[in-house]
């Protein structure tokens, strides 16, 4: 029951996490620029991985894709790649984990197969979460190290004076969504891996006994059920019967001096 709950919870947490990673990747507010008041209208600029947007105080918003930008930095391309890899791995992980769920019966799938699928999906969720966290962190690092502009640059260009408008870049909502979503996917993956351990068929801690009746006179050793099943005082797999009973891994072996103690 606990295994099913752990697996189910891991699946749900990962599902929420991956939905968050998708949302963060699509969001425009990865970085926001301080609001500046133009004499005409207050303007708020923000940008995502795919486009840049402008929102005016009137509520009007215009977004433009980066396809017209010349030479996007390699780091931005890397962030895009990390987020997409995270989404793809997460999506595959979700697909695998649906079939791995203990509460869902698909044909005559054995627990060992479900355990393997659960582990696979768990690892995929962990890698997916790490990709998202890495992508968001790389972007945040880019903002912190390269793009903080505390002073207004002013210079004279052809056709008049040119000066920068915004002062600095700040973290957008998408960064926080991405961090949280990546963390959730990671946690979900860990839970799936833990659930996998419970799903795997455990090795028996005693040897099976095969019985070979050697005629009518069978002398039983004292100990009853406990002795005959390998529990209780008979912990060293000693022979239970004087006649013909051997542990499975000794069935084909010849008697030795250690057979009867």
């Amino acid at each position: 029951m606990a295994v099913t709950a752990c697996q189910g919870l891991g699946f749900v947490v990962s599902l929420i996490g991956i939905a968050g990673i998708i949302a963060a990747t699509c969001m425009d507010q990865w970085s926001t620029q301080d609001l500046y008041n133009n004499p005409v209208t207050a303007v708020f600029n923000y940008q995502g991985l795919w486009r840049s947007c402008v929102r005016e105080s009137s509520g009007f918003t215009e977004c433009r894709g980066y396809f017209t930008l010349l030479g996007l930095p390699a780091m931005l391309q890397a962030v895009r790649a990390l987020m997409i890899v995270g989404i793809v791995l997460g999506a595959i992980g979700l697909l695998v984990s649906i079939f791995a769920l203990k509460c869902i019966r698909i044909g005559s799938m054995e627990d060992s197969a479900k355990a393997n699928m659960t582990l696979t999906s768990g690892i995929m969720f962990i890698v997916s979460g790490l990709c998202a966290i890495a992508g968001v962190s790389v972007f945040a690092n880019m903002l912190v190290t390269n793009f903080w502009m505390s002073t207004a640059n002013m210079y004279t260009g052809m056709g008049g004076m040119v000066q920068t408008v915004q002062t600095r870049y700040t973290f957008g909502a998408a960064l926080f969504v991405g961090w949280v979503a990546g963390g959730l996917t990671l946690i979900g993956g860990v839970m799936m891996c833990i659930a996998c351990r419970g799903l795997a068929p455990e090795e028996t801690n005693y040897k099976a006994v095969s019985y070979h009746a050697s005629g009518h006179s069978v002398a039983y050793k004292p100990g009853g059920f406990k002795a005959s099943t390998g529990f209780g005082s008979n912990t060293k797999n000693k022979k239970i019967y004087d006649g013909g009973a051997r542990t499975e891994d000794e069935v084909q072996s010849y008697p030795s001096k250690h057979d009867y103690v």
Epitope: N38, T41, V43, N45, P73, V162, T164
Partner: nanobody, 123 residues
């Protein structure tokens, strides 16, 4: 290099009309707010009219009802239709734009000024 080039200025009689144009050229990613400013001899530069991408406009009290600002976002061009001109409208008219070039990421908006065009209202 991004630049704003004004045109349409000249000598006009009081009560007359003029249409100023401002064309933004260069590798422009997007333009936010565009506006017209003027500077009369011995005075400070003042906002005449401004227009945002969304069409929000603002006019100086002295030109309300006489001047009309408009822009063509596709052509990155700004216009100022000036009617019922007065002697006090004589000044150098400057085009102003908050724009982002295609060379920077994250997108940085720059405040760019034109070199100005002279409007003289005199009989």
């Amino acid at each position: 290099e991004v630049q704003l080039v004004e045109s349409g200025g000249g000598l006009v009689q009081p009560g007359g009309s003029l249409r100023l144009s401002c064309a933004a050229s260069g590798s422009i990613f997007s333009i936010n707010v565009m506006g017209w400013y003027r500077q009369a001899p011995g005075k400070q530069r003042e906002l005449v009219a401004g227009i945002s991408t969304g069409g929000t406009t603002r006019y100086a009290d002295s030109v309300k009802g006489r001047f009309t600002i408009s822009r063509d976002n596709a052509k990155n061009t700004l216009y100022l239709q000036m009617n019922s001109l007065r002697a006090e409208d004589t000044a150098v008219y400057y085009c102003n734009a908050d724009l982002a070039t295609s060379y920077s990421w994250p997108v940085r908006y720059l405040e760019v000024w034109g070199q100005g065009t002279l409007v003289t209202v005199s009989s």
